[in-house]
Amino acid sequence: EPPTACREKQYLINSQCCSLCQPGQKLVSDCTEFTETECLPCSESEFLDTWNRETRCHQHKYCDPNLGLRVQQKGTSETDTICTCEEGLHCMSESCESCVPHRSCLPGFGVKQIATGVSDTICEPCPVGFFSNVSSAFEKCRPWTSCETKDLVVQQAGTNKTDVVCGPQDRQR
């Protein structure tokens, strides 16, 4: 790391080290030989999250309901607002600027992991012995019916999309 001219939490201006403004405050005027750095708190709708020499605070993120967003955590003078998605929606990207509906798992696929506000539904193919006959964002693959436990026999084999069909055992004459 290259050498620095100032202490931590200071910056160099006019060949002098001045204190940075603390998080939640913006720079009004640089220090001089006789005066300290002048800082002012950010307004209610603004923030700065680091020791800084910014002359303007950043605007809090707006969670636009038209994009499916709602406030998860209200911003402070030191932190930005955190948005999340409304029920049934998840973020399109890491920055969560808009939301999209959770996808459904098609017949033949079941839900491996239910969607959250930040992640989409994860589907998995139904393995042998399991099926899903619906398009759903919640349903897992269900096991085929066990005909034997009902004293029945398989009349039609199951698939990944259909359950087995059970029927009575043929009686021997």
């Epitope: 790391e1 050498p3 620095t4 001219a5 100032c6 202490r7 931590e8 200071q10 160099l12 060949s15 002098q16 080290c17 001045c18 204190s19 220090c31 001089t32 030989e33 005066t35 300290e36 750095t37």
Partner: antibody, heavy 126, light 107 residues
Framework: QVQLVQSGAEVKKPGASVKVSCKAS????????MHWVRQAPGQGLEWMGW????????NYAQKFQGRVTMTRDTSISTAYMELNRLRSDDTAVYYC???????????????????WGQGTLVTVSS | DIQMTQSPSSVSASVGDRVTITCRAS??????LAWYQQKPGKAPNLLIY???TLQSGVPSRFSGSGSGTDFTLTISSLQPEDFATYYC?????????FGGGTKVEIK
């Protein structure tokens, strides 16, 4: 009372490394930068760099970049200075020195050394 | 880097004399200057900081003045224990730099 106690004298061969320790007592170790200053025989004082014991942040003089490492162990209130690839002109007394308190300084770096270690003589000779 | 030039490099004086040492910075350093006293085999001892503030426990015969590039350390009435080497140090920006030292010797 504030005390900085350094490790004992060292004799090293050129190309070797040396690690000098500085144990602080009598004050809050993490509340003050620790600097290292050296003095070659019959010569003046030369600043080497600082460590912030609270954050572990360091700042080294350009001359020593890549050769010096300053570390600390807050559990035993001790700062360390390691100098690598020693040369004969590194023969000097090495001092640790305590700066003004963190947050004391608003303009300038205002690094003034009110307490010093007793010094550690490092001799580099083949 | 800021160069600190001290003069004279040595001065011979008698007990009771007034001694003045000057220190010049290669660029303005406001009032960010310290003075140290060092005796043979010992670590330096802080006398004055921010150009003119006397460190606690330092006798009032020591005084400092100046700002910008030119600074002065004055010993108003030299005492036997004052025979030592004196260093100035700029504390405006890193790297910190010291003057070459002024040795105050007995005449």
């Amino acid at each position: 009372q504030v005390q900085l106690v350094q490790s004992g004298a060292e004799v090293k061969k050129p190309g070797a490394s040396v690690k000098v320790s500085c144990k602080a007592s009598g004050y809050t170790f993490t509340g003050y930068y620790m600097h290292w200053v050296r003095q070659a025989p019959g010569q003046g004082l030369e600043w080497m760099g600082w460590i912030n014991p609270d954050s572990g942040g360091t700042n080294y003089a350009q001359k020593f970049q890549g050769r010096v490492t300053m570390t600390r162990d807050t559990s035993i209130s001790t700062a360390y200075m390691e100098l690598n690839r020693l040369r004969s002109d590194d023969t000097a007394v090495y001092y640790c020195a305590r700066d003004q308190p963190l947050g004391y300084c608003t303009n300038g770096v205002c690094s003034y050394f009110d307490y010093w270690g007793q010094g550690t003589l490092v001799t580099v000779s083949s | 880097d800021i160069q600190m030039t001290q003069s004279p490099s040595s001065v011979s004086a008698s007990v009771g004399d007034r001694v003045t040492i000057t220190c010049r910075a290669s660029q303005g350093i406001y009032s960010w200057l310290a003075w140290y006293q060092q005796k043979p085999g010992k670590a330096p001892n802080l006398l004055i900081y921010t150009a003119s503030t006397l460190q606690s426990g330092v006798p009032s015969r020591f005084s400092g003045s100046g700002s910008g590039t030119d600074f002065t350390l004055t010993i108003s009435s030299l005492q036997p224990e004052d025979f030592a080497t004196y260093y100035c140090q700029q504390a405006n920006i890193f790297p910190l730099t010291f003057g070459g030292g002024t040795k105050v010797e007995i005449k």
